[in-house]
């Protein structure tokens, strides 16, 4: 039961985190404008990864994309990848989760198969997760650098009497929304990755033949071994032992009274 | 047909207050800012402050603070400004005027009201 | 608060002539986000409020004549009338309406032989 609460849990949150990852990576947000010392502005700026947008005081927003592709910083078009790669991989990881819940049953799919998909789904959101927090922390570096070189200049350079205030930009909402998004899914894999071990069956190697000594002597026969050896037609056995190939996993493969997980 | 219909010229003691109206019609009141200008003889526009009707935000001229109050009555698409405590230097006419949805520019105004402060 | 500078403060022409008139800001009204410039030209007419001309330096408010012309970027603007009118006397502003709080220039005032 435990198990199927943390791979279930672990999906909800991934599945959160994902469309959080979506959210920012759309959100025209990542940086605004610093109102440093004017808090009210007739012209608000900010920037997102693909356009940027002005807010005057009426209301009236305007929003202008980036048709650019070589023009644009590296670091942008980093972040970018990033978060792609980061969507693109959490979307794959939950298309694999969904077939791996324990609650949904796909025809005979062994547990073994859903614990290996729980395992894969788990790694591809932890991954999706640090691609965002990676792609959101370098956007983040990339405008504190900015922020400084900008400060440096607004008090550098004036010759004149003439002023030019150069826009200065800070973390925007989306920066945040990254962070958390990118947090949850994170955990949300780590989650899935726990509800892995527990769905995986504790392999007991039953290769070796197991032999019970009976309880009466028995005495050689030439036409064979079905007298107290395990091959035989001991039905109470026959389950365990069939051959030796068959292990425990299979057996629980099978819903039984006893089948609580 | 937008329209900025401004109260009747005032003739006011110094030291007292008054309270000038404006009143919109032709456009939705509370989807643009309206922005109160002062205008002395012989001298230029000064701009006095700006309020949003909708959520009756306001923003004014630091050298206007505690001066004049501008507030909006979205019921009747009325906008007004209280100047306080008068003196001879408010004596001006005041123009009330719209922001267009674009360049943060005043594209309809009032025609203007008139304050006397005379003793 | 920006400062407005306007230049000449009156100038007197002839019917058809063109005219030029500068304003000037103490900081650049060019917004980096949108490459636009905020700035705004305002035509008053005696006895009358002010009527919006220009905005964003040069783009002309529906209604007004073609002959007005708005031009310059950063902190130097110019306001062109080509073939003055008589209709055209008037006092003309010049204001910033890119930070708070929004200033104006001292005027221009056309004069018409």
């Known amino acids: 039961m435990a198990v199927t609460a943390c791979q279930g849990l672990g999906f909800v949150v991934s599945l959160i985190g994902i469309a959080g990852i979506i959210a920012a990576t759309c959100m025209d947000q990542w940086s605004t404008q610093d109102l440093y010392n004017n808090p009210v502005t007739a012209v608000f700026n900010y920037q997102g990864l693909w356009r940027s947008c002005v807010r005057e005081s009426s209301g009236f927003t305007e929003c202008r994309g980036y048709f650019t592709l070589l023009g644009l910083p590296a670091m942008l078009q980093a972040v970018r990848a990033l978060m792609i790669v980061g969507i693109v991989l959490g979307a794959i990881g939950l298309l694999v989760s969904i077939f791996a819940l324990k609650c949904i049953r796909i025809g005979s799919m062994e547990d073994s198969a859903k614990a290996n998909m729980t395992l894969t789904s788990g790694i591809m959101f932890i991954v999706s997760g640090l691609c965002a927090i990676a792609g959101v922390s370098v956007f983040a570096n990339m405008l504190v650098t900015n922020f400084w070189m900008s400060t440096a200049n607004m008090y550098t350079g004036m010759g004149g009497m003439v002023q030019t205030v150069q826009t200065r930009y800070t973390f925007g909402a989306a920066l945040f929304v990254g962070w958390v998004a990118g947090g949850l899914t994170l955990i949300g894999g780590v989650m899935m990755c726990i509800a892995c071990r527990g769905l995986a069956p504790e392999e007991t190697n039953y290769k070796a033949v197991s032999y019970h000594a009976s309880g009466h002597s028995v005495a050689y026969k030439p036409g064979g071994f079905k007298a107290s050896t395990g091959f035989g037609s001991n039905t109470k056995n026959k389950k365990i032992y069939d051959g030796g190939a068959r292990t425990e996993d299979e057996v629980q493969s099978y819903p039984s009274k006893h089948d609580y997980v | 047909q937008v329209h900025l219909q401004q109260s009747g010229a005032e003739v006011v003691r110094p030291g007292t207050s008054v309270k000038v109206s404006c009143k919109a019609s032709g456009y939705a009141f509370t989807n643009y800012l309206i922005e109160w200008i002062k205008k002395r003889p012989g001298q230029g526009l000064e701009w006095v402050g700006v309020i949003n009707p909708g959520r009756s935000g306001t923003n004014y001229n630091e050298k206007f603070k505690g001066k004049a109050t501008l507030t909006a009555d979205k019921s009747s698409s009325t906008a007004y400004m209280q100047l306080s405590s008068l003196t001879s230097d408010d004596s001006a006419v005041y123009f009330c005027?719209?922001?267009?949805?674009?360049?943060?520019?005043?594209?309809?105004w009032g025609q203007g009201t008139s304050v006397t402060v005379s003793s | 608060d920006i400062v407005m500078t306007q230049s000449p403060s009156s100038l007197t022409v002839t019917a058809g002539e063109k005219v030029t008139m500068s304003c000037k800001s103490s900081?650049?009204?060019?917004?980096?986000?949108?490459?636009?410039?905020?700035l705004t030209w305002y035509q008053q007419k005696p006895g009358q409020p002010p009527t919006l001309l220009i905005f964003w330096a040069f783009t002309r408010e529906s209604g007004v004549p073609d002959r007005f012309t708005g031009s310059g970027s950063g902190t130097d603007f110019t306001l062109t009338i080509n073939s003055v009118q008589a209709e055209d006397l008037a006092v003309y502003y010049c204001?910033?309406?890119?930070?708070?709080?929004?200033?104006f220039g001292s005027g221009t005032k056309l004069e018409i032989k």
């Open positions: 204001q910033n309406s890119y930070s708070y709080p929004f200033t």
């Open positions: 005027a719209r922001t267009r949805y674009g360049g943060n520019a005043m594209d309809y």
């Open positions: 900081q650049s009204l060019l917004n980096s986000g949108n490459q636009k410039n905020y």
